[in-house]
């Protein structure tokens, strides 16, 4: 940590890596919830034109795909993996790619992924082959 940069009172954003260097936040697509045409594809682009610097260095990129009788939506945000999102733990937060996993939600089809490389929630991957055969 640079000596002239104060440690914060609430320590909210003074996150450091193992070497004590300040951890910088990553970039994520951040369009919140938008209608989507992504359906029955192995992967989709988010079509989100907004890339934001995540508010906190520990945050990762998240994408949530939901389909019900009326529409399909795709949500793109930054989120702290220590906290649940839509009541689910972000199990794959360390992944460099956003690999969609289905979650049980009544009345809809619900997939979610998280990842920790810049703008990684721009490309969301549904492919089962990718999940099982690709070591990344």
């Amino acid at each position: 940590i640079p000596p002239h940069v104060q440690k914060s009172v609430n320590n909210d954003m003074m996150v450091t890596d193992n070497n004590g260097a300040v951890k910088f936040p990553q970039l994520c697509k951040f369009c919140d919830v938008r209608f989507s045409t992504c359906d029955n594809q192995k992967s989709c682009l988010s079509n989100c034109s907004i890339t934001s610097i995540c508010e906190k260095p520990q945050e990762v990129c998240v994408a949530v795909w939901r389909k019900n009788d009326e529409n399909i939506t795709l949500e793109t945000v930054c989120h702290d993996p220590k906290l649940p999102y839509h009541d689910f733990i972000l199990e794959d937060a360390a992944s460099p790619k956003c690999i969609m996993k289905e979650k049980k939600k009544p009345g809809e089809t619900f997939f979610m992924c998280s990842c920790s490389s810049d703008e990684c929630n721009d490309n969301i991957i549904f492919s089962e082959e990718y999940n099982t055969s690709n070591p990344d």
């Epitope: 260097a21 300040v22 910088f24 970039l27 610097i53």
Partner: nanobody, 122 residues
Framework: EVQLLESGGGLVQPGGSLRLSCAAS???????QMWWVRQAPGKGLEFVS?????????YYANSVKGRFTISRDNSKNTLYLQMNSLRAEDTAVYYC???????????????WGQGTLVTVSS
């Protein structure tokens, strides 16, 4: 020796504008990823804006998007932050910083300036 020297801070009324500068030396400025980071009194760091090189792609925190503009002049080795529609919550010490990958995946060297104080108050 890497040096980053910020200037342009001061007292400004809400709704006003300021332009911060960061003069860089001791490294090849035009090839580096540069950031503006701020720290409000008693608070943590907030990462305001980033500009990449090459290409000059720019990124912003949601809190400043549409109000702040980051830019660079590689011929002058200078980074800028144009701040418009300033609010009381923008009051902070503003630092410029640079990041360079160490060559080990996911790790970086970072360098910081000494900061310049921006106070937004009527």
């Amino acid at each position: 020796e890497v040096q980053l020297l910020e200037s342009g801070g001061g007292l400004v009324q809400p709704g006003g504008s300021l332009r911060l500068s960061c003069a860089a030396s001791g490294f090849t400025f035009g090839t580096e990823q540069m950031w503006w980071v701020r720290q409000a009194p008693g608070k943590g760091l907030e990462f305001v804006s980033r500009i990449d090189s090459p290409g000059g792609r720019t990124y912003y925190a949601n809190s400043v998007k549409g109000r702040f503009t980051i830019s660079r002049d590689n011929s002058k080795n200078t980074l800028y932050l144009q701040m418009n529609s300033l609010r009381a919550e923008d009051t902070a010490v503003y630092y410029c910083a640079k990041r360079r990958p160490t060559g080990v995946s996911g790790t970086f060297y970072d360098y910081w300036g000494q900061g310049t104080l921006v106070t937004v108050s009527s």
